[in-house]
Interface confidence: low
């Protein structure tokens, strides 16, 4: 079941999924200038078995000064709309990003692809925030948001995460702040 | 290759001031925060100060706000510290160190220059 | 101030030996880090965020802790593990004294 809304989102942070669950899929989108290649997939899809999980399908681009009869593939509107995207340049890449069953790690980049990837998160996925450079976080909480199944409608769990800028607070490796409790989250989880 | 490399060994005398260089690489200077870190002989380390490139801010160990300089040439990708009035107490090595976080945002450094020996000694 | 205190100055350990290192907070914190420098060099990042290996790390070392217990844990140490061990606090930058780790 895909989310049908984005992660929320954190002033100053941007959020990264450490792997992408079955059935999460990544929109084609080729940088300014080229397209993708006539009848070339639209999305890369996270598919697999129990022991093994791969990205379906592949994401090729072409350049658009190149003479070609077809129409030029561009998204449908359903496609264009606010899809969380995740930008591809991250300060480090986890280092315990994959190898959970039923997930796919970071696909490869391909030739001339967009600056920002979009994905289509689906429920149960996990993505993690952190402060961008030059903000630093103030914890309350995990800073972590899951897409859940509630009532039958998706929803996204708020991260507990605050990003502050060393101007506001005269210090980036200031004094540790309190810690709240897991039990003291300001997220509820009670059920129907 | 992200890489910190910095200026070579210096002697001075005490009262003196030395500036020690740090010339980034691999990376886009003005994003990461740069730490000054140093290690007197057979002691362990002693984080001195930060600078952030992208803006020129700055912050302090209390033990060195009053005898040291961050500064940061972001064309020449290189930072500066500066202490002066030098005492034999301050003969150390001297580190610049990267500041990155986790996914979690939580900082640490994640790479380092060589190292520079500053002697102080009459 | 967050001051942290490691414990033992020194561990002197036969290859295949288990290392366990400390590192006390003077008040709680949420996250440590760990760094190995090795005479002469550099320190290297080691563990960071309490219990994550920085790359290139050998799988059998670990860190875990709480509030204000930390422990970076060999499971069998090996020569090249000989070494000088730091933590710090992820948010004041403060070093703790450091453990140094040798190998008979």
């Known amino acids: 079941e895909l989310c049908d809304d984005d992660p929320p989102e954190i002033p100053h942070a941007t959020f990264k999924a450490m792997a992408y669950k079955e059935g999460t899929m990544l929109n084609c989108e080729c940088k300014r200038g080229f397209r993708r290649i006539k009848s070339g997939s639209l999305y890369m899809l996270c598919t697999g078995n129990s022991s093994h999980s791969s990205w379906d399908n592949q994401c090729q681009c072409t350049s658009s000064a190149t003479r070609n009869t077809t129409k030029q593939v561009t998204p449908q509107p359903e496609e264009q709309k606010e899809r969380k995207t995740t930008e591809m340049q991250s300060p480090m890449q986890p280092v315990d990003q994959a190898s959970l069953p039923g997930h796919c790690r970071e696909p490869p980049p391909w030739e001339n692809e967009a600056t920002e990837r979009i994905y289509h998160f689906v429920v149960g996925q996990m993505v993690y925030y952190q402060c961008v450079q030059g903000y630093r976080a103030l914890h309350r909480g995990p800073a972590e948001s899951v897409c859940k199944m509630t009532h039958g409608k998706t929803r996204w769990t708020q991260p507990q995460l605050i990003c502050t800028g060393e101007m506001e607070t005269s210090q980036f490796p200031g004094e540790e702040k309190p810690q709240a409790s897991p039990e003291g989250r300001p997220e509820s989880e009670t059920s129907c | 290759e992200v890489q910190l490399v910095q200026s070579g060994s210096e002697l001075k005398k005490p009262g003196a001031s030395v500036k020690v260089s740090c010339k980034a690489s691999?990376?886009?200077?003005?994003?990461?925060?740069i730490n000054w870190v140093r290690q007197a002989p057979g002691q362990g380390l002693e984080w001195m100060a930060w600078i952030f490139p992208g803006n020129g801010n700055t912050y302090f160990n209390e033990n060195f706000k009053d005898r040291v300089t961050l500064t940061a040439d972001k064309f020449s990708s290189t930072a500066y510290m500066e202490l002066s009035s030098l005492r034999s107490e301050d003969t150390a090595v001297y580190y610049c160190?990267?500041?990155?976080?986790?996914?979690?945002?939580?900082?640490?450094?994640?790479?380092w220059g060589q190292g520079t020996t500053v002697t102080v000694s009459s | 101030e967050i001051v942290l205190s490691q414990s033992p100055a020194t561990l002197s350990l036969s290859p295949g030996e288990r290392a366990t290192l400390s590192c006390r907070a003077s008040?709680?914190?949420?996250?440590i880090h760990w760094y190995q420098q090795k005479p002469g060099s550099s320190p290297k990042p080691w563990i960071y965020?309490?219990?994550n290996l920085a790359s290139g790390v050998p799988g059998r070392f670990s860190g875990s802790g709480s509030g204000t217990s930390y422990s970076l844990t060999v499971s069998r140490v090996e020569a090249e593990d000989a070494a000088t061990y730091y933590c710090?606090?992820?948010?004041?930058?403060?070093f703790g004294g450091g453990t140094k780790v040798e190998i008979k």
């Open positions: 710090q606090h992820w948010n004041s930058f403060t």
């Open positions: 160190a990267r500041a990155t976080y986790d996914h979690g945002g939580y900082w640490y450094f994640d790479v």
């Open positions: 691999g990376y886009t200077f003005t994003d990461y925060y």
């Open positions: 008040s709680s914190v949420s996250h």
């Open positions: 965020a309490t219990s």
